[in-house]
Amino acid sequence: MMTGTIETTGNISAEKGGSIILQCHLSSTTAQVTQVNWEQQDQLLAICNADLGWHISPSFKDRVAPGPGLGLTLQSLTVNDTGEYFCIYHTYPDGTYTGRIFLEVLESSVAEHGARFQIP
């Protein structure tokens, strides 16, 4: 039985040209995390594998940085980065857990962050 839950940064906003950290956290399970895939609207952004480490998709190499931890840092944000992001935790023996984050990239200087994780 899958007992785990994923906490995420939820709905977040950031300024155009700035950067943002996408974070998910799997809790309430003793399952081993074997891999975390970060996806954006049917595109692979990055993968963090317990054995192989990080793989960043070539098309995002200039704007995506691994970490902190299993999270992902998006840099040089544009309005086109607005949308849904998914962290997909592959675990053994539980299976797959998915978390969702909605990012809004704003033109203005007013941007609020989600409450679960504070972004410095």
Epitope: T34, Q35, E39, D42, Q43, L44, I47, N49, D51, L52, H55, S57, S59, H90, Y92, P93
Partner: antibody, heavy 118, light 107 residues
């Protein structure tokens, strides 16, 4: 340099058995999932089985389930495919392939031919 | 099982031509689509992974696009060494499945 070298193919009668091996070198074998893929003469590619890095997760094609067994020995950097109850339709070149991140197959061996015939 | 349908099954083209091969999945597979090239008597070679990522060492004339159920492999300017058979493959779910292949021949 990444290398995958299959062996163990040959001619076998229907109902017989064979054990294929795939010797890996040039990378940390124990960190990668691995697959077997086959290709019948003049036909396309067919996935046969795969195994995760620690052998905790294994999958088979329906066509070989219950007859073939995939395994690995990380201390020997070797992947295996035990094939029992072989049929004429199992005749093919068998390739082993490395599967980084369980998403793609980036390196393939040269293949070993299995012929099932009486 | 997820069925992968490639089209065309074969095509004739000339050096310098732009070639497009399509692959359709029987259900949504997100970006879990890879493209391989195979020459007679040789093992397949990875060209494109995760729908649009170019494998290291593969010429930039190869590109991939698509998501969900419809995917495309494009060769922008066909070279003599590109005459081969091309396969798509889904890695979204087990059993992993391949398309039937597209043979690119010299016109």
């Amino acid at each position: 340099e990444v290398q995958l070298l299959e062996s163990g193919g040959g001619l076998v009668q229907p109902g017989g058995s064979l054990r294929l091996s795939c010797a890996a070198s040039g990378f940390t074998f124990s960190s990668y999932s691995m697959s077997w893929v086959r290709q019948a003469p003049g036909k396309g590619l067919e996935w046969v089985a795969d195994i995760s890095s620690s052998a905790s997760t294994i999958g088979y094609a329906d066509s070989v389930k219950g007859r073939f067994t995939i395994s690995r020995d990380n201390s020997k950097n070797t992947l295996y495919l035990q094939m029992n109850s072989l049929r004429a339709e199992d005749t093919a070149v068998y390739y082993c392939a490395r599967e980084p991140y369980d998403v793609w197959m980036d390196y393939w061996g040269q293949g070993t031919l299995v012929t099932v015939s009486s | 099982d997820i069925q992968m349908t490639q089209s065309p099954s074969s095509l004739s083209a000339s050096v310098g031509d732009r070639v497009t091969i399509t692959c359709r999945a029987s259900q949504s597979i997100s970006y879990y689509l890879n493209w391989y090239q195979q020459k007679p008597g040789k093992a397949p070679k990875l060209l494109i992974y995760a729908a649009s990522s170019l494998q290291s060492g593969v010429p930039s004339r190869f590109s991939g696009s698509g998501s969900g159920t419809d995917f495309t492999l494009t060769i922008s300017s066909l070279q003599p060494e590109d005459f081969a058979t091309y396969y798509c493959q889904q890695s979204y779910s087990t059993p992993l499945t391949f398309g039937g292949g597209t043979k690119v021949e010299i016109k």
